[in-house]
């Protein structure tokens, strides 16, 4: 039975700045030749029929839900893209993470401007800080990593703060073993 396709993002962020580029790829089942792909944005069928959907110079209207479909196979699970205009944007590799999976956070400056004295906060408390911009890279996420994150930093010698982002780490489902 063909599996549901999966939408992936490159770069992997589902929160991007206005004017940035992102490519959505519909990763399908390898067992059949893909002739065309259907893309849905906020429920509406897109004109794009390739397995990759390129968003160039993102606009606010590009925000929303994206799904893809290969031939008559089920639609993919939705991916949500949000387009921002701000000085700082906290980006995460995923907002819902399975326990044991990696989690990557970065504090991204508008127009890729340098951000320094970057501080990450989790649930209102300073978590990680450094003189220049830096990332948080958790190899194996745990439930304790769930929380509300935001970052602060200086751009052109002025202090800014990102919008908060909720990260949820969920327990991996325990496999069931049946006695033969």
């Amino acid at each position: 039975v063909p599996q549901k396709p999966k939408v992936s993002l490159n770069p992997p962020w589902n929160r991007i700045f206005k004017g940035e580029n992102v490519t959505l790829t519909c990763n399908g089942n390898n067992f059949f030749e893909v002739s065309s792909t259907k893309w849905f944005h906020n429920g509406s069928l897109s004109e794009e029929t390739n397995s990759s959907l390129n968003i160039v110079n993102a606009k606010f209207e590009d925000s929303g839900e994206y799904k893809c479909q290969h031939q008559q196979v089920n639609e993919s699970e939705p991916v949500y893209l949000e387009v921002f205009s701000d000085w700082l944007l906290l980006q995460a590799s995923a907002e819902v993470v399975m326990e044991g999976q990696p989690l990557f956070l970065r504090c991204h400056g508008w127009r890729n401007w340098d951000v320094y004295k970057v501080i990450y906060y989790k649930d209102g408390e300073a978590l990680k800080y450094w003189y220049e911009n830096h990332n948080i890279s958790i190899t194996n996420a745990t439930v304790e990593d769930s929380g509300t994150y935001y970052c602060t930093g200086k751009v052109w010698q002025l202090d800014y703060e990102s919008e908060p982002l909720n990260i949820t780490v969920i327990k991996a489902p325990r496999e069931k073993y049946w006695l033969q």
């Epitope: 978590l127 220049e132 830096h134 200086k154």
Partner: antibody, heavy 121, light 111 residues
Framework: EVQLVQSGAEVKKPGESLKISCEGS????????IAWVRQKPGKGLEWMGI????????KYGPSFGGQVTISADKSINTAYLEWSSLKASDTAMYYC??????????????WGLGTLVTVSS | QSVLTQPSSVSGAPGQRVTISCTGS?????????VHWYQLVSGAAPKLLIY???NRPSGVPDRFSGSKSGTSASLVIAGLQAEDEADYYC???????????FGGGTKLTVL
């Protein structure tokens, strides 16, 4: 009470390996950077590098990258400084220090007593 | 040669006031990176004296104060006492080197 307890003095020969330690207590170890600072005999302080135990992010001073390895084991609240092949010029006092954020300033607020490393043939 | 320049030694009689300077550049002190001061007494752990140019941690006597002007910072010790005899280091961050930097240290002698 915050404490950084360093391992004892070491006397080694050139070419030998060494790993010294710094154990933190009295605070949430994984949420603060731990730095290593060198003081050669009669000289000033030099920043060697730093590790954030929460995600093992490590940064090295330009003079020390490739010369030493900084690591940490957050399960036992301990940071390490390691040499694979010591030189006589590594003879120095090595301090570990906690990097904290206080009122927007990033500072070394607590220090260990230092580990004296002597490398001599 | 340290990135932050301090006088190698200063001295003063008990009760006097001494100033230790720390001169940097546009990529450290002049680039809005704070300056902190540490005291090293032989055989003891280094101690934070002043942070963010002017702030004193609890337990540090108010005889110690700090200031900043342009690309320089200063530590002032008023009413010198015998126990102030120590080495003093300023510290900041240098964006062009991407590293934490210390001054060369100043030996304070109480006459």
């Amino acid at each position: 009470e915050v404490q950084l307890v360093q391992s004892g003095a070491e006397v080694k020969k050139p070419g030998e390996s060494l790993k010294i330690s710094c154990e933190g207590s009295g605070y949430r170890f994984s949420s603060y950077w731990i730095a290593w600072v060198r003081q050669k005999p009669g000289k000033g302080l030099e920043w060697m590098g730093i590790i954030y135990p929460y995600d093992s992010d490590t940064k090295y001073g330009p003079s020390f990258g490739g010369q030493v390895t900084i690591s940490a084991d957050k399960s036992i609240n301990t940071a390490y400084l390691e040499w694979s092949s010591l030189k006589a010029s590594d003879t120095a006092m090595y301090y570990c220090a906690r990097l904290a954020l206080i009122r927007g300033s990033i500072i070394f607020d607590y220090w260990g007593l230092g580990t004296l490393v002597t490398v001599s043939s | 040669q340290s990135v932050l320049t301090q006088p190698s030694s200063v001295s003063g009689a008990p009760g006097q006031r001494v100033t230790i300077s720390c001169t940097g550049s546009s990529s450290n002190i002049g680039a809005d990176y704070d300056v902190h001061w540490y005291q090293l007494v032989s055989g003891a752990a280094p101690k934070l004296l002043i942070y963010g140019y002017t702030n004193r941690p609890s337990g540090v006597p108010d005889r110690f104060s700090g200031s900043k002007s342009g690309t320089s910072a200063s530590l002032v010790i008023a009413g010198l006492q015998a126990e102030d005899e120590a080495d003093y280091y300023c510290q900041s961050y240098d964006s062009s080197l991407s590293e934490v930097v210390f001054g060369g240290g100043t030996k304070l002698t109480v006459l």
